[in-house]
């Protein structure tokens, strides 16, 4: 279902004067450089803001900060600095809220030059804030136990672990020489720790420790470790591997009682390995090539993370900025959008429907001309911008956006040729998961999804002050606009409730002056645009992954197939706060297209079939499991992970244990003699980039 | 500490052209509204231009306007004033200074203009 | 233009005696936004001048409070409830509400 084109776009009739009677202004008595906002709870229309002020003298910084609060969905706001004792919050650790509605909230205190630090903490929705004394000063934001909003771990500027059970009013010290601290599942705690040295120059001499029992006792789980991550079940560690300066990955589904050697391949010194996204079926795995090329491979693994078949050559993941495109559509179901560099150093895009199996281009939307870079003026595809070409300092105000209760819609900056331009993108959308695309709006843009897709809403990306903002209420095809102010403001950001739920957009920034510029804050409500509720005659069914209606086996990916409820374009009305995706889902008989290449094989480009890899032709295929060397007979195949097909093709695979000993335990990694080969191509390393571009974990 | 140190100010003839710059320091500079504003040998003040916390308005008194020009450039923490067909009248010493919630919050130390043959 | 007539020109005063300075604009200082933008500036011998009390009333900071200011309209006034030997020096009102923005003339306050 693409998007419907040549409809004539007639205005929503009275709009302006409804949503002027739904647009409230705050302006904020404040001169601050900065303003954080943060959501507190779900539903709850609380909104912190805190604005910080900070100004160099000499060889300190003096800083103040307000804080205030909303709970009207940011309509009005309310000074409540004097909670926070007019303190000066660190606004690099942010708004610290718990986990799912505990209405909990951490704001650390800049107490410079002290020992200890400060912080305040409120349980309920920040109406209070009571302050504690920390007896270490933090490294980084506190974090929560997921599953216990009252336990607190912190990282100190010395490198210890403290953890709190009482939601910070007492501390204790858990270990010294920390590098790096994780929550894992059930309330376990790993970290890295260095015995005998630092954190900075000791990389790949670290323990991996847990602890079950919040510190009364702990584990060495794993030694001779760079870097560890956690994504979905698994565990990772990229562990030194004995010869010389080469990390392998190991990986763990039970919490570090037993490893097994991923099949990836070593990583030297200058490379590194990121988990691009993770669940608890599988994982996309990033393995830089060696030298400073600005990309790798990404491998996908099996439902246990140590096999791995090739998903993506000459993946686009630079090294200096750590910068990545690599995006989960989480509007549709298997679907990621990436950027590759091409050999001619072009960037191109490409997308996956199907988990990581089959890459292709963007298809070229039906409304744009190919640009200056197509060769071919027919023939060209559509290119997304995101984390690389933002850090690049491109036009690009925003990565592309999709939500998974706005079933099917990708809204991105993007170009039409045979690569990325550096010409000013245009906005492009994407109704049925990124199948097809057309130009929804000209120049770059600032764009927000609100009542589950019901209403989409645009401002302008430009360094003059704006006071214009633009909605649709049919997915992008029609666009009215509302001057929701006469004096312009420069804009610094549009605000809405994290999941797409609201109704309300609150557009952020400040005032030009010839006094002072001040904060203001205009909370537009579009509930009087949708005035009715949806209904049944609203929705209409759509079929997802659909590209050939005539085939039965239309729409299957991962083994199924799933029929959605989806609003019709033309209806003009609220899903509402409590809307639900309704999906039917229905099984499909098996094709090879729901197996991934086995171990030793892989898929030559537009065919299903998986060959042998040449270096491993006539070689017996074997691999370190649970310490066993395994043999393994296979025709080429293995299950997608999730993939829940019955019937239909089913090729042989079969595991022998071949009855002798090996290891990939990491804590004598040097007595490793598998005989396994890596999979084809790339290598890699690991950082913490997570909060920046949702990348699970990079060494 | 808010700082603003003034330069530029020189002996020109009457009909020629100057260009002053005041560097601001201890605040940050692109949330506030500037002015010039002149004192003249006999004391008086006078103001001479204003500009936006962005730089995107400007205001002049009819005795300057289109021959004084007001920019600033936020990156560098800079305010300008280019003058023009400068008169006799124009000598003084020229104050930068900066708003807040009011007018001519802070000044600085001034650079002197004289305009003569 | 506004005119910010002040008076006295000068005022003669002993240390620890109380001053007063009156400031009348020829048309109202009161804004569309209701504020009024008359400020009170000092410039002492040798120096540039110095922002004491902005809004009418509201006093800089730093600022002593036996400065205060009042005043509404067109009439303002600034009072010193005991005169220091770092308040000489000359004394400037100005608005900011109409433009172009106008300064008295100064009023010189010095020692008998």
């Known amino acids: 279902r693409s998007t419907e084109q040549g409809e004539s776009c007639s205005g929503l009739l009275g709009a302006d004067a409804k949503l002027a009677g739904n647009t409230h202004q705050h302006i904020f008595n404040d001169l601050s450089g900065s303003v954080s906002l943060a959501w507190v709870g779900d539903g709850t229309g609380v909104i912190l803001a805190l604005t910080t002020f900070q100004v160099p003298i000499f060889m300190i910084t003096i800083g103040q900060s307000k804080l205030y609060r909303s709970e009207d969905y940011g309509k009005s706001f309310e000074d409540v600095t004097n909670l926070i004792n007019n303190t000066f919050i660190r606004s690099d650790f942010g708004i610290a809220i718990g986990p799912e509605n505990s209405g909990k909230v951490i704001l650390t205190a800049d107490v410079s030059g002290s020992h200890g630090s400060r912080i305040f903490v409120s349980s309920d929705f920040g109406k209070s804030f009571t302050h504690q004394e920390l007896p270490f000063v933090p490294l980084m934001q506190i974090t929560y136990n997921p599953e216990n909003s009252n336990v607190l771990l912190a990282l100190s500027n010395k490198n210890e672990l403290w953890l709190s059970e009482d939601f910070g009013t007492n501390w204790k010290k858990l270990y010294d020489t920390v590098c790096l601290a994780k929550w894992g599942r059930k309330g376990t705690i790993f970290f890295t720790a260095n015995h005998n040295g630092s954190c900075s120059n000791d990389r790949g001499m670290l323990e991996l420790e847990r602890t079950t029992d919040y510190g009364k006792s702990f584990k060495t789980v794993a030694s001779k470790i760079y870097s560890f991550g956690l994504g979905g079940k698994f565990l990772f560690a990229s562990v030194m591997t004995g010869k010389g300066t080469l990390r392998a990955i190991h990986v763990s589904v039970d919490d570090g009682d037993t490893w097994n050697m991923a099949q990836l391949p070593s990583v030297g010194q200058e490379q590194f390995y990121s988990i691009l996204a993770a669940n608890d079926d599988m994982v996309f795995m990033h393995v830089d090539e060696p030298g400073d090329t600005g990309f790798g491979t990404i491998f996908t693994s099996d439902d246990r993370g140590i096999v791995y078949s090739k998903s993506l050559d000459r993946h686009l993941y630079t090294t200096t900025g750590g910068e990545t495109d690599f995006t989960n559509v989480t509007s549709l179901r298997g679907v990621y959008i990436t950027s590759v560099l091409s050999e001619d150093n072009s960037i191109q895009t490409m997308i996956t429907f199907d988990q990581g199996g089959r890459w292709t281009h963007l298809r070229k939307p039906e409304n744009s001309e190919c640009d200056a870079t197509a060769k071919n003026k027919n023939e060209c595809s559509l290119h997304i911008h995101a984390s690389y070409s933002i850090s690049q300092k491109l036009n690009v105000p925003m990565a592309p956006l999709s939500e998974p209760n706005a079933v099917g819609i990708v809204i991105a900056h993007g170009s039409v040729g045979d690569a990325i331009s550096v010409m000013v993108p245009d906005v492009y959308i994407s109704d049925d998961g990124g199948y097809s695309w057309t130009k929804m709006l000209e120049g770059p843009h600032y764009y927000t999804i609100l009542d589950s897709g019901g209403i989409i809403v645009a401002i302008e990306h430009s360094s003059r002050p704006i006071n214009v903002i633009k909605f649709s209420t049919d997915e992008g095809q029609c666009w009215q606009t509302y001057t929701f102010t006469r004096d312009p403001i420069y804009f610094t950001g549009l605000a809405s409730e994290p999941g797409a739920r609201s109704m309300n957009i609150s557009i952020w920034g400040f005032t030009e002056s010839f006094l002072t510029s001040q904060w203001v804050s205009y909370t537009i409500d579009f509930k009087d645009i949708l005035e009715r509720n949806c209904e049944e005659k609203d929705y209409t069914i759509w079929l997802a992954h659909s590209t050939d209606p005539e085939d039965y086996e239309d729409g299957c990916i991962l083994g199924y197939k799933e029929q959605f409820l989806r609003l019709r374009k033309s209806s003009v009305c609220q899903n509402g706060r409590d809307y639900v995706v309704t999906k039917q889902p229905s099984i499909c008989l098996c094709s090879l297209e729901d197996f991934l290449c086995d171990f030793g094989y892989y898929r030559p480009e537009n065919d299903s079939k998986c060959v042998e890899q040449p270096e491993l032709k006539g070689h017996d295929l074997e691999f370190c499991l649970y310490g066993r060397e395994e043999h393994l007979t296979t025709n080429g195949y293995r299950k997608i992970p999730g993939d829940k097909c019955q019937g239909g093709v089913n090729p042989v695979r079969e595991v022998k244990d071949l009855k002798k000993k090996c290891t990939s335990n990491f804590l004598s990694p040097e007595k490793q003699n598998s005989k396994s080969n890596g999979s084809a191509g790339g290598s890699g390393g690991l950082n913490d980039i997570f909060e920046a571009q949702k990348i699970e974990w990079h060494e | 500490e808010v700082h603003l140190v003034e330069s530029g100010g020189d002996l020109v003839n009457p009909g020629g052209s100057l260009k002053l710059s005041c560097e601001a320091s201890g605040f940050i500079f692109s949330i506030y509204g500037m002015s010039w504003v002149r004192q003249t040998p006999d004391k008086r003040l006078e103001w001479v231009a204003m500009i936006s916390s962005g730089g995107i308005y400007t205001q002049y008194p009819d005795s300057v306007k289109g021959r004084f020009t007001i920019s600033r450039d936020n990156a560098k923490n800079t305010l300008y004033l280019q003058m023009s067909g400068l008169k006799s009248e124009d000598t003084g010493t020229y104050h930068c200074t900066r708003h807040d919630d009011s007018w001519f919050a802070y000044w600085g130390q001034g650079t002197l203009v004289t305009v003569s043959a | 233009d506004v005119v910010m007539t002040q008076t006295p020109l000068t005022l003669s005063v002993t240390i620890g005696q109380p001053a007063s300075i009156s400031c009348k604009s020829s048309?109202?200082?009161?804004?569309?936004?209701?504020?009024?933008?008359l400020n009170w500036l000092l410039q002492r011998p040798g120096q540039s001048p110095k922002r004491l009390i902005y809004?009418?009333?509201k006093l800089d900071s730093g600022v002593p409070d036996r400065f205060t200011g009042s005043g509404s309209g067109t009439d303002f006034t600034l009072r010193i409830s005991r005169v220091e030997a770092e308040d000489l020096g000359v004394y400037y009102c100005c608005q900011g509400t109409h433009f172009p923005l106008t300064f008295g003339a100064g009023t010189k306050l010095e020692l008998k």
């Open positions: 809004l009418v009333s």
């Open positions: 048309q109202s200082l009161l804004d569309s936004n209701g504020k009024t933008y």
